[in-house]
Amino acid sequence: SHTLPVRLLRPSDDVQKIVEELQSLSKMLLKDVEEEKGVLVSQNYTLPCLSPDAQPPNNIHSPAIRAYLKTIRQLDNKSVIDEIIEHLDKLIFQDAPETNISVPTDTHESKRFILTISQQFSECMDLALKSLTSGAQQATT
């Protein structure tokens, strides 16, 4: 195989651009989801976000986030998720294990799942971008 070592493949400005794009798309998704009135956030769902034992951007739980967003896509046809998934795939190693998500079957519970995960995803991308930029600052000092 002629694949170069991973560290040679992707300049940090690309990673930052990917995460910035994800952050922007996460806000679009949340805005769309929040238009549904009378839905409350649930404590039953937690989106894995950053891993403390890895360096950015590998500290982002991209495969798990992808699986959660794929579940939202199945429950509610939000086209912005297609673009989110394409960008997450830029951060996911091709041999990363699959994550299985149990899909809520009740309509109201589905709406709570969508709102909760969308909110957590938006917060996660804010954190991811912060971790990237602070990591970049540490690398230059």
């Epitope: 493949l9 990363a96 699959e98």
Partner: antibody, heavy 122, light 107 residues
Framework: QVQLVQSGAEVKKPGSSVKVSCKAS????????MQWVRQAPGQGLEWMGA????????RYSQKFKGRVTITADKSTSTAYMELSSLRSEDTAVYYC???????????????WGQGTTVTVSS | AIQMTQSPSSLSASVGDRVTITCRAS??????LAWYQQKPGKVPKLLIY???TSASGVPSRFSGSRSGTDYTLTISSLQPEDVATYYC?????????FGGGTKVEIK
């Protein structure tokens, strides 16, 4: 080494459909996007769509939406591209292509099928 | 959709000449750009991926570079076997559009 083998040439009548297959071998990755591209005689390359076979997730060019369907059979490592309501302008060579690299997203298509010529004529 | 504007559409150069082909993306696509070579009647062949990484077995006279949203394929010393049409393709977000192609001929 990845190999992509496509189905043979087809001659079709206007208004009919064609289904082209692309069988992949020699790879172990599960997370990848495979694309379909066509090239009309004397013309450039035109992106038609892509599939993420692990989930059957698809993306289509707006130009072909509603006329093209891309599917994959994981058990046989075969992808399919079906184009319906054929017209003479669909006469082209159709290619499938497959990426290499450490990420699920592509940044170049390293492997290409040999191409399938589809002729649409009454 | 992201547009890829490729120029020139054709060029004629002498053996040994330095040849440059440019693709301009309608928005920032990072390094998510590939270059292909297609000889008449043949399958496209990947030359450069990730804007500037050479694919396996590609002669060193082919190189890729990027400046903002402008991407350049350079053939440092044109050879007779380089007669072909060259295409760029972006992979930022679908649709993964191609440039219109550049036909390279020998003078």
């Amino acid at each position: 080494q990845v190999q992509l083998v496509q189905s043979g040439a087809e001659v079709k009548k206007p208004g009919s459909s064609v289904k082209v297959s692309c069988k992949a071998s020699g790879y172990t990755r599960t997370r990848y996007w495979m694309q379909w591209v066509r090239q009309a005689p004397g013309q450039g390359l035109e992106w038609m769509g892509a599939i993420y076979p692990a989930e059957g997730d698809t993306r289509y060019s707006q130009k072909f939406k509603g006329r093209v369907t891309i599917t994959a059979d994981k058990s046989t490592s075969t992808a399919y591209m079906e184009l319906s309501s054929l017209r003479s302008e669909d006469t082209a060579v159709y290619y499938c292509a497959f990426p290499e690299g450490p990420y699920a997203a592509p940044y170049g298509m390293h492997y290409w099928g040999q191409g399938t010529t589809v002729t649409v004529s009454s | 959709a992201i547009q890829m504007t490729q120029s020139p559409s054709s060029l004629s150069a002498s053996v040994g000449d330095r040849v440059t082909i440019t693709c301009r993306a309608s928005r920032n696509i990072g390094n998510y750009l590939a270059w292909y070579q297609q000889k008449p009647g043949k399958v496209p062949k990947l030359l450069i991926y990730y804007a500037k990484t050479s694919a396996s077995g590609v002669p060193s006279r082919f190189s890729g570079s990027r400046s903002g949203t402008d991407y350049t394929l350079t053939i440092s010393s044109l050879q007779p076997e380089d007669v072909a049409t060259y295409y760029c393709q972006h992979f930022w977000s679908t649709p993964w559009t191609f440039g219109g192609g550049t036909k390279v001929e020998i003078k």
